[in-house]
């Protein structure tokens, strides 16, 4: 009778993560009597995957009933495959021995490759906000995919970006891989509504790439422009001074009125109007009584935006002037108006 051979017909098996792998093995003879064991890897450090004789292997089932006397099919199924299961699996026939069974013959091995999907890309921007014309960096990370080949693209509002660097780790063989990419984006004043998108394509995704997004609204700071104007209102001795705060983002803004350098009033932007580009406008005003003034008054609108150093705009109020013919009195009727008498 010919000596027993252990046949593993599949050189390699490719399985998607989460699925079941079938590893085939047959023996050409029933003798010598003895059990079959499955190992991952070879040599002294090999890992026992299944032992016909004893042990608990909850993820492993046998294809046929190994307790049957004439069974020569030692194929197994491994459930819920993960990238960590990748490797070469050997079906090994033992002969009965004492005190331990003795390895008799091994199959040639079956390489199990695991296809694992990348995790959803996570895009993160800079820790601090930046202003238009500045270049900021965005990072994109995705993990746990296999095989190593992967494609990553960056987009800003649908337009592909070219200024980015990507690394896939580790460089050598591994059960699964991670990708890390950094893209540089130049901010513009119109970017409040913009999005940066990281798109990852992998063989496991069947042409339906994964995307991670970052809203530039989290990154950009558009500093306001200020304009201070005066208008006459109702009585000849009252002047309405307005401070127009335009095109700012984010909304966090504090305005202080100074009269000849002294703090007159501080308020926080609340009832703002939003522009189409996502920036905000806000207006604050003072009703100034000039009748008691002998000298000119210097009014300053000082704005602290998003914790940045204050910017200001001043307006000189001439007390000798009679501005009754300028503008209209509509601002005085605004419910947000604030009267301020100067003595």
């Amino acid at each position: 009778e010919e000596e027993l051979q252990v046949i593993q017909p599949d050189k390699s098996v490719l399985v998607a993560a989460g699925e079941t792998a079938t590893l085939r093995c047959t023996a050409t003879s029933l003798i010598p009597v003895g059990p079959i064991q499955w190992f991952r890897g070879a040599g002294p450090g090999r890992e026992l995957i299944y032992n016909q004789k004893e042990g608990h292997f909850p993820r492993v089932t046998t294809v046929s009933d190994l307790t049957k006397r004439n069974n020569m099919d030692f194929s197994i199924r491994i459930g819920n495959i993960t990238p960590a299961d990748a490797g070469t699996y050997y079906c090994v026939k033992f002969r009965k021995g004492s005190p331990d069974d003795v390895e008799f013959k091994s199959g040639a091995g079956t390489e199990l490759s695991v296809r694992a999907k990348p995790s959803a890309p996570v895009v993160s921007g800079p820790a601090a906000r930046a202003t238009p014309q500045h270049t900021v960096s965005f990072t994109c990370e995705s993990h746990g995919f296999s095989p190593r080949d992967i494609t990553l693209k960056w987009f800003k509002n649908g337009n592909e970006l070219s200024d980015f660097q990507t690394n896939v780790d580790p460089v050598g063989e591994s059960v699964s891989y991670s990708i890390h990419s950094t893209a540089k984006v130049v901010l513009t004043r119109e970017d409040v509504h913009s999005q940066v998108i990281c798109e990852v394509a992998h063989v496991t995704l069947q042409g339906d790439p994964l995307r991670g997004t970052a809203n530039l609204s989290e990154t950009i700071r558009v500093p306001p422009t200020l304009e201070v104007t005066q208008q006459p209102v109702r009585a000849e001795n009252q002047v309405n001074v307005t401070c127009q705060v335009r095109k700012f983002y984010p909304q966090r803004l504090q305005l202080t009125w100074l009269e000849n350098g002294n703090v007159s009033r501080t308020e926080t932007a609340s009832t703002v109007t939003e522009n189409k580009d996502g920036t905000y406008n806000w207006m604050s005003w003072l009703l100034v009584n000039v009748s008691a003034h002998r000298d000119d008054v210097k009014l300053t609108c000082q704005v602290e935006h998003d914790g940045q150093p204050a910017v200001s705009k001043s307006h000189d109020l001439k007390v000798s002037a009679h501005p009754k013919e300028q503008g209209s009195n509509t601002a005085a009727e605004n419910t947000g108006s604030n009267e301020r008498n100067i003595y």
Epitope: L30, Q52, E54
Partner: antibody
Framework: QVQLVQSGAEVKKPGASVKVSCKAS????????IVWVRQAPGQGLEWMGW????????NYAQKLQGRVTMTTDTSTSTAYMELRSLRSDDTAVYYC?????????????WGRGTLVTVSS | DIQMTQSPSSVSASVGDRVTITCRAS??????LAWYQQKPGKAPKLLIY???NLQSGVPSRFSGSGSGTDFTLTISSLQPEDFATYYC?????????FGGGTKVEIK
């Protein structure tokens, strides 16, 4: 025909030795183990030991250790069991059997038995 | 050593009866249990291996079940030729041990 043929009955005096043979035919001798089991008159079955016909490795029952030796001759497909320093309580029918389980031990083919009587 | 305890030690039954013999191992032996039939002056004969597998040529009225420590041999309809002594045997590890036997006698 698959069978195990044992040697004939023996009468021995206490302190003597006995060697029982078991000749296999009809199958590949080296593919299976051989066990020896004895049965004293009116008693149950007692496992004595096991030998690999492939490599000659052995495993003996603790109580017989030092008195029993099991061997094989692959050229004649024969297994032997020698028991030394015989005592009267060694009087029994001695069976050889083929051990056929893959990852366990069970015995699917038995010899007819050899009666060994130890008497002064 | 693994002790094998068989019960009952004897049972009286009639032809056609259903007979159940139990065997308990002192520790878990998975499914590595065999059952043998022995008639007077004859060698034991393997009936069941690996707890529940019927040995080739054995009538289907014999069946085995159990795993771990508790096992059962059932003869579904006793026949005249079934009057004999039955032994269980653990085959999980050395030393191999047998139960004390159950004698099935004619009522």
């Amino acid at each position: 025909q698959v069978q195990l043929v044992q040697s004939g009955a023996e009468v021995k005096k206490p302190g003597a030795s006995v060697k029982v043979s078991c000749k296999a035919s009809g199958y590949t001798f080296t593919g299976y183990g051989i066990v020896w089991v004895r049965q004293a008159p009116g008693q149950g079955l007692e496992w004595m030991g096991w030998i690999s016909a492939y490599a000659g490795e052995t495993n003996y029952a603790q109580k017989l250790q030092g008195r029993v030796t099991m061997t094989t001759d692959t050229s004649t497909s024969t297994a032997y069991m020698e028991l030394r320093s015989l005592r009267s309580d060694d009087t029994a029918v001695y069976y050889c059997a083929r051990e056929a389980g893959s990852s366990w031990y069970d015995f699917d083919l038995w010899g007819r038995g050899t009666l060994v009587t130890v008497s002064s | 050593d693994i002790q094998m305890t068989q019960s009952p030690s004897s049972v009286s039954a009639s032809v056609g009866d259903r007979v159940t013999i139990t065997c308990r191992a002192s520790q878990g032996i998975s499914s590595w249990l065999a059952w043998y039939q022995q008639k007077p002056g004859k060698a034991p004969k393997l009936l069941i291996y690996a707890a529940s597998n019927l040995q080739s040529g054995v009538p289907s009225r014999f069946s085995g079940s159990g795993s771990g420590t508790d096992f059962t041999l059932t003869i579904s309809s006793l026949q005249p030729e079934d009057f004999a002594t039955y032994y269980c045997q653990q085959g999980a590890s050395f030393p191999i041990t047998f139960g004390g036997g159950t004698k099935v006698e004619i009522k």
